[in-house]
């Protein structure tokens, strides 16, 4: 959609084990109220408060890995838009289902 990008990035997904999976709360940031973003959580996709990212425009070294397969999800949510929104050396790359922070491959 032509709407502008919501600030911040999804909080890191907790490593806890899920005991009860929830149906998705949202399909994109624009289905979340206020500043909340549509994010993966331990037990599903939820509207969560974003976290700030330093220097979001910085491009990081390396290339995005090639992805294979077809996404079965309609309007997959993007969990990042730019490299600078990703922690450490991770890059923001288009995966099978939307953009996410992944380890780059050597250029």
């Amino acid at each position: 959609s032509g709407k502008s990008f919501k600030a911040g990035v999804c909080p890191p997904k907790k490593s806890a084990q899920c005991l009860r999976y929830k149906k998705p709360e949202c399909q994109s940031d624009w289905q979340c109220p206020g500043k909340k973003r549509c994010c993966p959580d331990t037990c599903g996709i939820k509207c969560l408060d974003p976290v700030d990212t330093p220097n979001p425009t910085r491009r990081k070294p390396g290339k995005c890995p090639v992805t294979y397969g077809q996404c079965l999800m309609l309007n997959p949510p993007n969990f990042c838009e730019m490299d600078g929104q990703c922690k450490r050396d991770l890059k923001c790359c288009m995966g099978m289902c939307g953009k996410s922070c992944v380890s780059p491959v050597k250029a």
Epitope: K22, K23, E25, C26, P33, K36, L72, M73, L74
Partner: antibody
Framework: QVQLQESGPGLVKPSQTLSLTCTVS??????????WSWVRQLPGKGLEWIGY???????YYNPSLKSRVTISIDTSKNQFSLKLSSVTAADTAVYYC??????????????WGQGTLVTVSS | EIVMTQSPTTLSVSPGERATLSCRAG??????LAWYQQKPGQAPRLLIY???TRATGIPARFSGSGSGTEFTLTISSLQSEDFAVYYC??????????FGQGTKVEIN
């Protein structure tokens, strides 16, 4: 005993916006265990899921209707609402509000409103 | 979206007999499947969820089975109040949730 009741005009003109409200009684709409849904049934046809809303205001819509649908919630009144814009005769249907478990292990629409027939005609 | 196909379209059964209704999913939905009963002029009523769990207040003569793409609703001994239209519905992974086109169970 949870009860749901739809209200709104039964006749809408083509190109206008259909607006319906569902009032929930016998239980709080603020429970995190449920999504609040709209489902419609075209005359003599099957059922079509329109979308749902969570108490927090987050929504998920059927992609086939997404560009025309808005579902909103008013927790203070224990109500949620449907707006469907740019309606045509093809939107003539019985519209139901329903409660749906928010977890996969409680899936299905366990409580329904009685349904309201909305006719699109000039 | 996942297409749900029900068969037969109409099932003619005598009271006291057994009725078996089928529902096929276009792709696997695990056990995320519900069955509903709808009578003329009424809202649907949830019978079964999780493919085989009876909803609150549903008589034991209704049972559901299956997983993946093939599902069955069985009514062991049809009562007069069971003549209605039955719908299956999937709620797997990502919406849109979709319904089958319905099976009408009529008196033979």
């Amino acid at each position: 005993q949870v009860q749901l009741q739809e209200s709104g005009p039964g006749l809408v003109k083509p190109s206008q916006t259909l607006s319906l409200t569902c009032t929930v009684s016998g239980g709080s709409i603020k429970s995190g265990d449920y999504y609040w849904s709209w489902v419609r049934q075209l005359p003599g046809k099957g059922l079509e899921w329109i979308g749902y809303i969570y108490y927090s205001g987050s929504t998920y819509y059927n992609p086939s209707l997404k560009s025309r649908v808005t579902i909103s919630i008013d927790t203070s009144k224990n109500q949620f609402s449907l707006k469907l814009s740019s309606v045509t005769a093809a939107d003539t249907a019985v519209y139901y509000c329903a409660r749906e478990g928010s977890y996969y292990d409680s899936g299905g629409f366990d409580y329904w409103g009685q349904g309201t027939l909305v006719t699109v005609s000039s | 979206e996942i297409v749900m196909t029900q068969s037969p379209t109409t099932l003619s059964v005598s009271p006291g007999e057994r009725a078996t209704l089928s529902c096929r999913a276009g792709q696997s939905v695990g056990n995320n499947l519900a069955w509903y009963q709808q009578k003329p002029g009424q809202a649907p009523r949830l019978l079964i969820y999780g493919a085989s769990t009876r909803a609150t207040g549903i008589p034991a003569r209704f049972s559901g089975s299956g997983s993946g793409t093939e599902f069955t609703l069985t009514i062991s001994s049809l009562q007069s109040e069971d003549f209605a239209v039955y719908y299956c519905q999937q709620y797997n992974n990502w919406p849109p949730w979709t319904f089958g086109q319905g099976t009408k169970v009529e008196i033979n």
